[in-house]
């Protein structure tokens, strides 16, 4: 078998054997080692040497194996847009951020630039669940059969109706998608309103 | 601006190793795009590349005096180093320290030189 | 190793004639990777050109490169007196680097 070409080699054809790795640098038509994450390039490759990569400094950061001169500038989450930070940056990863409780992306350019306010859900609803928080506005669904919601509020969620048996009550009122069941003590007289009802 | 000054002594014996140090003045030797050579001239003769290094490390040696060569760097001193052991009198020379442009704007030429120091090896 | 032979070994010439110098390698080179100095009696060499075309920072107009593969030449249009010194031409394209033997521009 061949032995393996080792950077920096010449190519021909303007590919290089491990393209996460290496990079062809077209004026010399070789191919080049890539510095990793966390590193940057501090010296140019040539035809008899290889790339020389140096650690990014504080607070900057390169996620990729890469030829960039300069390592990126670490970013704050911009409590402004509405962002909050869920890990910090390293040389290696750019400032971790998401929305803020309570809201949603509104923009999004590779990563989310900008949240805004979650709608409230109305009485009788409740947001639908999404896979990723804050990844989009709130759906609002109808609450399932035997359960309600009683606000308007972006985050409350749709509550079972209570079983007035389990408590050692009876029903007064049944509940509604709006609200809960009203139990009294079984001795209890009816209210005004549903004295006609139980007569019937 | 940079400049370069060559210091060592500037007699060896035989067999001794010849050591020179080469101060970088009006800059940093890690400000990055550079590689840090020695080069040498024998009496009334052409140029010789000995080898060069890079702050990080990264040292590259002439194959004919590789296995003789050391080049090394010293950041805190902002200054970087040639060993050349078990010396004859073929290595006697006018040795300089140049700096060997390599950043992303500029070609692998010796950009700048030291003035050189002469070493003579006799007993 | 990539052997550069340069010609002439000395030439003569007059302040305010034009010099032309050659450098010839054993194999072809990328003109990226060679470069022009020269060296005055006692000084250290001083860097001229490189990529084989440009000139180094400072350096007078009335030097010029050219050449590609194996062939190269260093002109300077009208020599003045400053310009009459040893010329080395120098590749990077190969390890070990190397250089020229020289060639020796002297005032007739």
């Known amino acids: 078998s061949q032995p393996q070409a080792v950077p920096p080699y010449a190519s021909e054809n303007q590919t290089c054997r491990d393209q996460e790795k290496e990079y062809y640098e077209p004026q010399h038509r070789i191919c080049c080692s890539r510095c990793p994450p966390g590193t940057y390039v501090s010296a140019k490759c040539s035809r008899i040497r290889d790339t020389v990569c140096a650690t990014c400094a504080e607070n900057s950061y390169n996620e990729h194996w890469n030829y960039l001169t300069i390592c990126q500038l670490c970013r704050p989450c911009d409590p402004v847009m509405g962002l909050e930070e869920i890990a910090p940056c390293t040389s290696k990863r750019k400032t971790q951020c998401r929305c803020q409780p309570g809201m949603f992306c509104a923009a999004w350019a590779l990563e989310c630039t900008h949240c805004e306010l979650l709608s409230d859900c109305p009485p009788g609803t409740e947001a639908e669940l999404k896979d990723e928080v804050g990844k989009g506005n709130n759906h609002c669904v109808p609450c399932k059969a035997g359960h309600f919601q009683n606000t308007s509020s972006p985050s409350a969620r749709c509550q079972p109706h209570t079983r007035c048996e389990n408590q050692g009550l009876v029903e007064a009122a049944p509940g509604t998608a709006q609200s809960d069941t009203t139990c009294k003590n079984p001795l209890e007289p009816l209210p005004p309103e549903m004295s006609g009802t139980m007569l019937m | 601006q940079v400049q370069l000054q060559e210091s060592g002594p500037g007699q060896v014996k035989p067999s001794q190793t010849l050591s020179l140090t080469c101060t970088v003045s009006?800059?940093?030797?890690?400000?990055?795009?550079?590689?840090w050579g020695w080069i040498r001239q024998h009496p009334g003769k052409g140029l010789e590349w000995i080898g060069y290094?890079?702050?990080?490390?990264?040292?590259y040696y002439n194959p004919s005096l590789k296995s003789r060569t050391t080049i090394s760097v010293d950041t805190s001193k902002n200054q970087f180093s040639l060993k050349l052991s078990s010396v004859i009198a073929a290595d006697t020379a006018v040795y300089y320290c140049?700096?060997?442009?390599?950043?992303?704007?500029?070609?692998?030429?010796?950009?700048?030189w030291g003035q050189g120091t002469m070493v003579t090896v006799s007993s | 190793e990539i052997v550069l032979t340069q010609s002439p070994g000395t030439l003569s010439l007059s302040p305010g004639e034009r010099a032309s110098l050659s450098c010839w390698s054993s194999?072809?080179?990328?003109?990226?990777?060679l470069a022009w100095y020269h060296q005055k009696p006692g000084q250290a060499p001083r860097l001229l050109i490189y990529g084989a075309s440009t000139r180094a920072t400072g350096i007078p107009d009335r030097f010029s490169g050219s050449g590609s593969g194996t062939d190269f030449t260093l002109s300077i249009s009208r020599l003045e007196p400053e310009d009459f010194a040893v010329y080395y031409c120098?590749?990077?394209?190969?390890?070990?680097?190397?250089f020229g033997q020289g060639t020796r521009l002297e005032i007739k």
């Open positions: 009006g800059g940093s030797i890690s400000s990055g795009g550079y590689f």
């Open positions: 194999q072809s080179i990328d003109s990226t990777y």
């Open positions: 120098q590749q990077y394209s190969s390890s070990p680097i190397t």
């Open positions: 140049a700096r060997d442009c390599s950043s992303v704007n500029c070609q692998d030429a010796f950009d700048i």
């Open positions: 290094i890079h702050y990080i490390g990264s040292p």
